[in-house]
């Protein structure tokens, strides 16, 4: 959850909610009674910005949360890493029937980086996210969290950027970290030929042809 947040060299981060200074200020619909930005303390006494919703008593929940616009920087496939807590409905009294244990992840490609509203029908569903059996127990300052981590990928992307959205249908969720990244093959030298940083293709198995150049003091 915390720390210097060093990621693998072949991953380029497009969004990291944990690195944002100040409030995240994402767009929620409805404006009140749904997703709420809540700060909690990490073990270094600095705030972690989370988004939370927990309307487990009320039926027919449809709460949306949308990120700011995310540039794709030429990536055709991006990865979304979500760290979250999701409370077991069995541990909550009197919520059977209304309490859920999943949420939905969506995306919407756009060239417009200033869309002000959430239009649900524009979004394409990536997946339904559930709490995995495996979780990391994290002791953050004055509280303990059971943190689930799920990674999904989406592509091929073609527009300048995209928005992510999270739909709650009646669960008790805290989104603790959202990171969006793409993968690249780092600069490589083979047989005196140098090949530049290269963004991976639209599929994980795609081959991307790149032109190399001779290293210094060598020639073709």
């Amino acid at each position: 959850v915390t720390g210097s947040r060093v990621y693998p060299a072949n991953e380029v981060t497009l969004l990291d909610s944990r690195s944002v200074q100040g409030e995240l200020g994402w767009i929620a619909s409805p404006l009140e009674g749904g997703w709420e930005e809540v700060s909690i303390m990490d073990e270094k006494n600095t705030p972690i910005r989370t988004y939370q919703v927990c309307n487990v008593m009320e039926p027919s929940q449809n709460n949306w949360l949308r990120t700011d616009w995310i540039t794709r920087e030429g990536a055709q496939r991006v990865y979304i890493e979500i760290k979250f807590t999701l409370r077991d409905c069995n541990s909550l009294p009197g919520v059977m029937g209304t309490c859920k244990e999943t949420f939905n992840l969506y995306y919407y490609e756009s060239d417009n980086d200033k869309e002000r509203f959430i239009r649900e029908n524009q979004f394409v569903k990536i997946d339904t996210i559930a709490a995995d059996e495996s979780f990391t127990q994290v002791d953050i300052g004055d509280r303990i969290m059971k943190l689930n981590t799920e990674i999904r990928d989406v592509g091929p992307l073609s527009k300048k950027g995209f928005y992510l959205a999270f739909q709650d249908v009646g669960a008790c969720i805290a989104l603790v970290s959202v990171r969006v990244f793409y993968k690249k093959c780092p600069l490589t030298v083979r047989n005196l030929a140098q090949f530049p940083d290269t963004i991976t293709g639209a599929d994980t198995s795609s081959l991307v042809e790149v032109r190399g150049s001779c290293v210094n003091n060598s020639e073709e």
């Epitope: 809540v38 909690i40 705030p47 927990c54 541990s91 303990i144 059971k146 008790c172 805290a174």
Partner: antibody
Framework: QVQLVQSGSELKKPGASVKVSCKAS????????MHWVRQAPGQGLEWMGW????????TYADDFKGRFVFSLDTSVSTAYLQISSLKAEDTAVYYC?????????????????WGQGTTVTVSS | DIQMTQSPSSLSASVGDRVTITCRAS??????LAWYQQKPGKAPKLLVY???NLADGVPSRFSGSGSGTDYTLTISSLQPEDFATYYC?????????FGQGTKVEIK
């Protein structure tokens, strides 16, 4: 229903020890940590610390390190507060209160259920 | 440690009055704050959590507001059963200290 029932009032002499119990019912004991709060006569509430009901690990506020011990007997869903070497200034009502052991968001992050309080009087 | 300063320490009011109690934290507690009501000889009862959210079963005349270091509990129209002592408590790093309390008395 969910409740925390504490042991009865105690009258002790200075230097003695006392053990206050807090019996939980109506919920899974290990789903909630147990906290202790002191209220001296005519005074406000003081948070003393808490005990992890899964591991038994206690955490004490600075003013309550040394003579105060939190413990558990999970087989009977009971938390205990023991005070040794009692002093006149330990005279107070002691409350137990629960909060979820794991943080799932602010919706349940507060003391929702309290014991009725145990009065401990220290007097010679 | 974070200090919680409540004001006033006591107040006299009549039934139907609007009552405001404030709580100031010594540093930003990011709305990690609860309000409790306590009557003589009884355990505290939760009124408001996360600074602004009314607890289940609490009458709508109670409301919480604030952010950063400054928080307020408001009773819009004081009722006879509201005469009690009110405490704020922060949840931003242990120790989770309480304010010193505000006693609401009948004028």
């Amino acid at each position: 229903q969910v409740q925390l029932v504490q042991s009865g009032s105690e009258l002790k002499k200075p230097g003695a020890s006392v053990k206050v119990s807090c019996k939980a019912s109506g919920y899974t004991f290990t789903d909630y940590s147990m906290h202790w709060v002191r209220q001296a006569p005519g005074q406000g509430l003081e948070w003393m610390g808490w005990i992890n009901t899964e591991t038994g690990e206690p955490t004490y506020a600075d003013d309550f390190k040394g003579r105060f011990v939190f413990s558990l007997d999970t087989s009977v869903s009971t938390a205990y507060l023991q005070i040794s070497s009692l002093k006149a200034e330990d005279t107070a009502v002691y409350y137990c209160a629960r909060i979820p052991l794991y943080y799932y968001g602010s919706r349940y992050w507060y003391f929702d259920v309290w014991g009725q309080g145990t009065t401990v009087t220290v007097s010679s | 440690d974070i200090q919680m300063t409540q004001s006033p320490s006591s107040l006299s009011a009549s039934v139907g009055d609007r009552v405001t109690i404030t709580c100031r934290a010594s540093e930003n507690i990011y709305r990690n704050l609860a309000w409790y009501q306590q009557k003589p000889g009884k355990a505290p009862k939760l009124l408001v959590y996360a600074a602004t959210n009314l607890a289940d079963g609490v009458p709508s005349r109670f409301s919480g507001s604030g952010s950063g270091t400054d928080y307020t509990l408001t009773i819009s129209s004081l009722q006879p059963e509201d005469f009690a002592t009110y405490y704020c408590q922060h949840f931003w790093g242990t120790p989770w200290t309480f304010g010193q309390g505000t006693k609401v008395e009948i004028k």
